[in-house]
């Protein structure tokens, strides 16, 4: 039988919130860096 996609791994369920938060934090940092770069330019 075919293996389930990663969303069926229990880990995905238990870490979903923290991984989403980490990703949002990463995107915010990226946006901040981009703004700083634009200011310099």
């Amino acid at each position: 039988s075919e293996e389930p996609p990663i969303s069926l791994d229990l880990t995905f369920h238990l870490l979903r919130e923290v991984l989403e938060m980490a990703r949002a934090e990463q995107l915010a940092q990226q946006a901040h860096s981009n703004r700083k770069l634009m200011e310099i330019i």
């Epitope: 293996e3 990663i6 791994d9 229990l10 238990l14 870490l15």
Partner: antibody
């Protein structure tokens, strides 16, 4: 069948880094998170972190943040755990492990002994 | 961090007799989804841990039915109905309900 085969034992000096590998087979590598757990000699188990081989999402136990780096190579179905600024307390057996839809550590590698000694 | 406390530290047993290991969490480990992610692992000397029980009372595939798990909230128990020689080793409880995930200190099951 699911198999996780780890790299061999390492001896390192304090302050150095070590990189342990974990080659997965018997399943689709990108379908399951990979975790790392360590066990100091005669001690209990300590969860270090987890990586999503599909998207590269990583979540580290705060205790190891800044010293541990987890990566994957999808082309070879291999996960890596690098620990830097080694100290004697890092002497331990390091395990990779995979879960299922029901449990977090259903399959384990054989372990890699890392000895930190001057 | 959720501290998982196991008792006893060592459990001397007679083969064929029952054994019981207790695990207490420092706070409730009921997850926000109403499940309790309490697992039990067996580690024989020189081997990696092996999953026995997940979500408090469910036996993993291939685990003999002499192993059973029970409990709720903060108090959990692993029972071996009749200890066999291959059951000797260290048993760990583990909680996956709260980050960071944490293991108990272990209970050594040995021959009396």
């Amino acid at each position: 069948q699911v198999q996780l085969v780890q790299s061999g034992a390492e001896v390192k000096k304090p302050g150095a880094s070590v990189k342990v590998s974990c080659k997965a087979s018997g399943y689709t590598f990108t379908d399951y998170f990979m975790k790392w757990v360590r066990q100091a000699p005669g001690q209990g188990l300590e969860w270090m972190g987890v990586i999503n081989p599909n998207q590269g999402d990583i979540f580290y136990n705060q205790k190891f943040k800044g010293r541990v780096t987890m990566t994957v190579d999808k082309s070879t179905s291999t996960a890596y755990m690098e620990l830097s600024s080694l100290r004697s307390e890092d002497t331990a057996v390091y395990y990779c492990a995979r879960g299922t839809d029901r449990a977090l550590f259903a399959y384990w590698g054989q372990g890699t002994l890392v000895t930190v000694s001057s | 961090d959720v501290v998982m406390t196991q008792t006893p530290l060592s459990s001397p047993v007679t083969l064929g007799q029952p054994a019981s290991i207790s695990c207490r969490s420092g706070q409730s480990i009921v997850h926000s989804d109403a499940n309790t992610y309490l697992e039990w692992y067996q580690q024989r000397p020189g081997q990696p841990p092996r999953l026995l029980i997940y979500k408090v009372s469910n036996r993993f595939s291939g685990v003999p039915d002499r192993f059973s798990g029970s409990g709720a909230g903060t108090d959990f128990t692993l029972k071996i109905s009749r200890v066999e020689a291959e059951d000797l080793g260290v048993y760990y409880c583990f909680q996956g309900s709260h980050i960071p995930w944490t293991f108990g200190g272990g209970t050594k099951v040995e021959i009396k």
